[in-house]
C-alpha cells in the first residue's frame, strides 16, 4: 500500500494569509491569520465593510490593507491615540497669529480668517482690506466707497432720489400737481433775475407823446414795471412799484421828479394802469381813475429831426441808469402785464416775439408766495452772529411750505470748503403719501420728523432754533433724534463752520459733492422763509435761478375733498 503524501507539502495555503497548515487524510486545513479567509486563506477580509463594525470603527476614513486595515483622517483632522477617532485641528489655537489682524475662526477641518462686513481678507498681507464695492457696480448712479462700506447716491439735481433698496434710483415724483398753465398774452416780468425782459424802440412822428397802458398783476411790493428813455439817454421815465404803490421817477432837461401815489396794487389782482403824457403833466390812472398828476414844464422826450425816438424797457433798465435814479430801487419785479398799448401803437409786433418764448409767458393763476420749480437755488449772505447774544451765532428759522414734490433741500448753509454744515430737507417717507423733514449736519441726519402729510392744499409751518448748544423744534411734532452725545458732536461741527464763512441757500444746493448731504434734490413747491426775524425776499438774493418765482406761487391743479388734502393740524400756521 502506498503511503499518502503530506498534503501540506508543497504548501497549498496562501503564504501571506495562513498561520498554519494541518495535514489530513488526502486533505489539508489552512488556519488563517486574522484578516484573512478562504480554504487556502487566499481572501483578504475587508474590515472596512464589516456590517457588525461599521467603517471598521473609524470615525473618518477606513483603509483596507491585505490582512489588515487602518483608520486615517481627512485633511485638517488629527488621529486620537485610540487610532480610530479623528479630531479637528484647531488651527486658530495652534497658530494664534495665523490670520494676522483678522479674526481667526476655526471650522471643521479648516479655519477662516474673518473680516468685518465691507472688508476682505488679504492672504499676502494677512490683514483685512476694504472692499471697493463701487468697482462692483453696486449703485445705479453714484457710488462713494468708504472703509467698511459704501453709499449710493442719486443725482437729485436731475430729479432722482435713492430707492428703498438703497442702490437704485427713481424719479422724484409729484405729490401735489400744480396748475402751470401759461398764456403768451401774459408777459412775465421776472424772466431774468438780473436784466430786462423786453426792449422796444419806437420811431414816431414828433407830435407823439409818451403813453403806456397795461393790465398789471403782482404780489411783489417793489420793482420796475417799465423804463423809457430818449435815444441820447438825456431824458428818462421810470414806472415802478414801491411799497405796493405806483412810483414814477422822471428826469429831463427841465425837471427831475419822483412821485408815489394811489392804492396798494400788489394784491394779486389785475389792475389797469395807464401812464399818459399830456401837454403840461403826466397822468397816472389805475382802473381809469387818476391817482397822480405830475407837472412838467415841457415835453418829456425831445424830438430830433422831426422824429420822436424812444426806447422802452420792461422789468428793468440799462445798468448805467442805476446811478442816475433819484431814489435807488431794486428793479426785480415778479409780476405780469397784459393788454399793453405803448405809444398808442397797440400790441403790434410784441405778441409775436413773446409767443415764441415760453419763459416769457406768465402763469394764468397764481397765489401769494415764492415758488421753487425744482431746477435751481437762491443764494443769500446772512450774518448769523449776534454780538449781544452770549451764545454767539444763532439761527431762528420759520418755514411755510407747500411742497409739490416730496423730496428736496429747502434750506442749506454751505461752507467755503464745500461742506454743508446745516440743511433742512424734505424726503418721501417710507409710509405712503407722507413726507419726513430731515435736519442734517454734513451727511448725518440729526433730527427726523416722520410721516407728515405735507403735500396738501394747506401750507405747513415749521419753526426751529439752533445755536452751538442746542437744536430746538418749536413746532409740536414727534421727532426722532440721535443721542445727546452724538448731537453735541454734530453741533460742534456746525459751530466750527459758523465761525467761518457760510452762504445760505434756499431751494437746494450749489455744486457740492453728492455725499455732502443726505438729500441733494432741489426743492419743488412753494415756500416762504423767515430767518432771525427777517422775511427773506428773493428779489434781494445774491443770486437766484431764473425759474424761481420770488412773489408768485402756482395754484394747486385741482382741489379734491379727500384725505390727501388733510395736513397735520400742528403744522398749520396760526397767523
Amino acid at each position: 500500500v502506498n503511503a499518502i503524501p503530506d498534503q501540506c507539502s508543497p504548501l497549498p495555503c496562501n503564504e501571506d494569509g495562513y498561520m498554519s497548515c494541518k495535514d489530513g487524510k488526502a486533505s489539508f486545513t489552512c488556519t488563517c491569520k486574522p484578516g484573512w479567509q478562504g480554504e487556502k486563506c487566499e481572501f483578504d477580509i475587508n474590515e472596512c465593510k464589516d456590517p457588525s463594525n461599521i467603517n471598521g470603527g473609524c470615525s473618518q476614513i477606513c483603509d483596507n490593507t491585505p490582512g489588515s486595515y487602518h483608520c486615517s483622517c481627512k485633511s485638517g483632522f488629527v488621529m486620537l491615540s485610540n487610532k480610530k477617532d479623528c479630531k479637528d485641528v484647531d488651527e486658530c489655537s495652534l497658530k494664534p497669529n495665523m490670520c494676522g489682524t483678522a479674526v481667526c475662526k476655526n471650522i471643521p477641518g479648516d479655519f477662516e480668517c474673518e473680516c468685518p462686513e465691507g472688508y476682505r481678507y488679504n492672504l499676502k498681507s494677512k490683514s483685512c482690506e476694504d472692499v471697493d464695492e463701487c468697482s462692483e457696480n453696486m449703485c445705479a448712479q453714484l457710488c462713494v466707497n468708504y472703509p467698511g462700506g459704501y453709499t449710493c447716491y442719486c443725482d437729485g439735481k436731475k430729479g432722482f432720489k435713492l430707492a428703498q433698496d438703497q442702490k437704485s434710483c427713481e424719479a422724484v415724483s409729484v405729490c401735489l400737481p400744480l396748475n402751470l398753465d401759461t398764456k403768451y398774452e401774459l408777459l412775465y416780468l421776472a424772466e431774468q433775475f438780473a436784466g430786462v425782459v423786453l426792449y422796444l424802440k419806437f420811431r414816431l412822428p414828433e407830435i407823439s407823446r409818451f403813453s403806456a397802458e397795461f393790465d398789471f398783476r403782482t404780489y411783489d411790493s417793489q420793482g420796475v414795471i417799465l423804463y423809457a428813455e430818449s435815444i441820447d439817454h438825456s431824458a428818462w421815465l421810470l414806472i415802478a412799484l414801491r411799497g405796493g404803490k405806483i412810483e414814477v421817477q422822471l428826469k429831463n432837461e427841465h425837471t427831475s421828479k419822483i412821485t408815489t401815489g394811489g392804492d396798494i396794487i400788489n394784491n394779486g389782482l389785475w389792475n389797469m394802469v395807464s401812464v399818459e403824457e399830456l401837454e403840461h403833466s403826466i397822468s397816472i390812472k389805475i382802473a381809469k381813475e387818476a391817482v397822480m398828476d405830475i407837472n412838467k414844464p415841457g415835453p418829456l422826450f425831445k424830438p430830433e429831426n422831426g422824429l420822436l425816438e424812444t426806447k422802452v424797457y420792461f422789468a428793468g433798465f440799462p445798468r448805467k441808469v442805476e446811478s442816475e435814479l433819484i431814489k435807488p430801487i431794486n428793479p426785480r419785479l415778479d409780476g405780469c402785464i397784459r393788454s399793453w398799448n405803448l405809444m398808442k401803437q397797440g400790441a403790434s409786433g410784441i405778441k409775436e416775439i413773446i409767443q415764441e418764448k415760453q419763459n416769457k409767458h406768465c402763469l394764468v393763476t397764481v397765489e401769494k408766495g415764492s415758488y421753487y420749480p425744482g431746477s435751481g437755488i437762491a443764494e443769500f449772505h446772512i450774518d448769523y452772529n449776534n454780538g449781544s447774544n452770549a451764545e454767539g451765532w444763532h439761527i431762528n428759522v420759520t418755514l411755510n411750505i407747500r411742497p409739490s414734490m416730496g423730496t428736496g433741500v429747502m434750506l442749506a448753509l454751505v461752507s467755503s470748503n464745500n461742506t454743508v454744515p446745516f440743511a433742512v430737507s424734505l424726503v418721501d417717507s417710507t409710509s405712503e403719501k407722507s413726507q419726513d423733514i430731515v435736519i442734517s449736519v454734513e451727511n448725518t441726519v440729526i433730527y427726523r420728523i416722520q410721516a407728515l402729510s405735507l403735500c396738501s392744499n394747506q401750507r405747513s409751518h415749521l419753526e426751529f432754533r439752533v445755536n452751538r448748544n442746542n437744536l430746538e423744534l418749536l413746532t409740536p411734532l414727534k421727532i426722532e433724534t440721535i443721542s445727546q452725545e452724538e448731537l453735541q458732536t454734530q453741533l460742534a461741527i456746525l459751530d466750527k463752520a459758523m465761525k467761518g464763512k457760510v452762504a445760505t441757500y434756499l431751494g437746494g444746493l450749489p455744486d457740492v459733492p453728492f455725499s455732502a448731504t443726505p438729500v441733494n434734490a432741489f426743492y419743488n413747491g412753494c415756500m416762504e422763509v423767515n430767518i432771525n426775524g427777517v422775511e427773506l425776499d428773493l428779489d434781494e438774493a445774491i443770486s437766484k435761478h431764473n425759474d424761481i418765482r420770488a412773489h408768485s406761487c402756482p395754484s394747486v391743479w385741482k382741489k379734491t375733498k379727500n384725505s390727501e388734502d388733510q395736513v397735520d393740524p400742528r403744522l398749520i400756521d396760526g397767523k
Partner: antibody
Framework: EVKLEESGGGLVQPGGSMKLSCAAS????????MDWVRQSPEKGLEWVAE??????????YYAESVKGRFTISRDDSKSAVYLQMNSLRPEDTGIYYC??????????WGQGTTLTVSS | QIALTQSPAIMSASPGEKVTMTCSVN?????MHWYQQKPGSSPRLWIY???NLVSGVPGRFSGSGSGTSYSLTLSSMEAEDAATYYC?????????FGGGTKLEIK
C-alpha cells in the same frame, strides 16, 4: 497601545522640591505634546503644564498657579516627560496625571502619582 | 480667564431615565470636551469637539452646544454610566476644567 506611567510622588514638606517622571510607550513620542494635570478634592481637575513637540520648538506653558515654581521638560530619546516642582505648597497636594495631548484635549491618561505636601 | 461652571454638581437617575448636565462658560468658546472618571480610575476622554463620541462610548451619550452653553445628555441611564463627568476647553494657552457633575444611580 498607549501607555503612560507616572512615578516620583510622595510626601514632601512645604517649601521642598520633588521631581515627577512619566514613561511613555505605544506612540511616536517625539511628535507628541505632553501635559501634567492634577486632581485634588478641593480643586478638582486642574491643568498644570505642557511641553510641545520638537516641531513646536519644545515650547512650554504653565498654569498661573505654578508659574516660576514648576518646570516641565522632556527627553525624546527616553520617551519620558518630567515635572520639576520647587517651593511646594500644601495646595499643590493631589494626584498628578501625565497625559498625551492631541489637538488641545487630553487623549490618554496615566494612572497617576500622588504628591502630598505637608509638615 | 475663562471659567467653566458645571451643573448640577451631583445628580441621581433611575435606570432608563434621561439625564442632562450642563457646562456654562463665562466667554464664548469654539469647542467643549467631556471626560468620564470612575472612582479609583483616571479620567477618560468621553466626548470631543462638543458632539463627537470617542470610539467605544455607547450611543446613548450625546453632546451639544455652542458659544457659552454646552451639555452632555444620556438618553437612558444605565448602572455603568454612574461616574463623574468633567467638561474641558482650551483658550489662550490655558486649559480649563469644570468642577464636575457626579452622576449616581438610584
Amino acid at each position: 497601545e498607549v501607555k503612560l506611567e507616572e512615578s516620583g510622588g510622595g510626601l514632601v514638606q512645604p517649601g521642598g522640591s520633588m521631581k515627577l517622571s512619566c514613561a511613555a510607550s505605544g506612540f511616536t513620542f517625539s511628535d507628541a505634546w505632553m501635559d501634567w494635570v492634577r486632581q485634588s478634592p478641593e480643586k478638582g481637575l486642574e491643568w498644570v503644564a505642557e511641553v510641545r513637540s520638537k516641531a513646536d520648538n519644545h515650547a512650554t506653558y504653565y498654569a498661573e498657579s505654578v508659574k516660576g515654581r514648576f518646570t516641565i521638560s522632556r527627553d525624546d530619546s527616553k520617551s519620558a516627560v518630567y515635572l520639576q516642582m520647587n517651593s511646594l505648597r500644601p495646595e499643590d497636594t493631589g494626584i498628578y496625571y501625565c497625559t498625551l495631548t492631541t489637538a488641545f484635549l487630553f487623549d490618554s491618561w496615566g494612572q497617576g502619582t500622588t504628591l502630598t505636601v505637608s509638615s | 480667564q475663562i471659567a467653566l461652571t458645571q451643573s448640577p454638581a451631583i445628580m441621581s437617575a433611575s435606570p432608563g431615565e434621561k439625564v442632562t448636565m450642563t457646562c456654562s462658560v463665562n466667554s464664548s468658546v469654539s469647542y467643549m470636551h467631556w471626560y468620564q472618571q470612575k472612582p479609583g480610575s483616571s479620567p477618560r476622554l468621553w466626548i470631543y469637539d462638543t458632539s463627537n463620541l470617542v470610539s467605544g462610548v455607547p450611543g446613548r451619550f450625546s453632546g451639544s452646544g455652542s458659544g457659552t452653553s454646552y451639555s452632555l445628555t444620556l438618553s437612558s441611564m444605565e448602572a455603568e454610566d454612574a461616574a463623574t463627568y468633567y467638561c474641558q476647553q482650551y483658550s489662550g494657552y490655558l486649559y480649563t476644567f469644570g468642577g464636575g457633575t457626579k452622576l449616581e444611580i438610584k
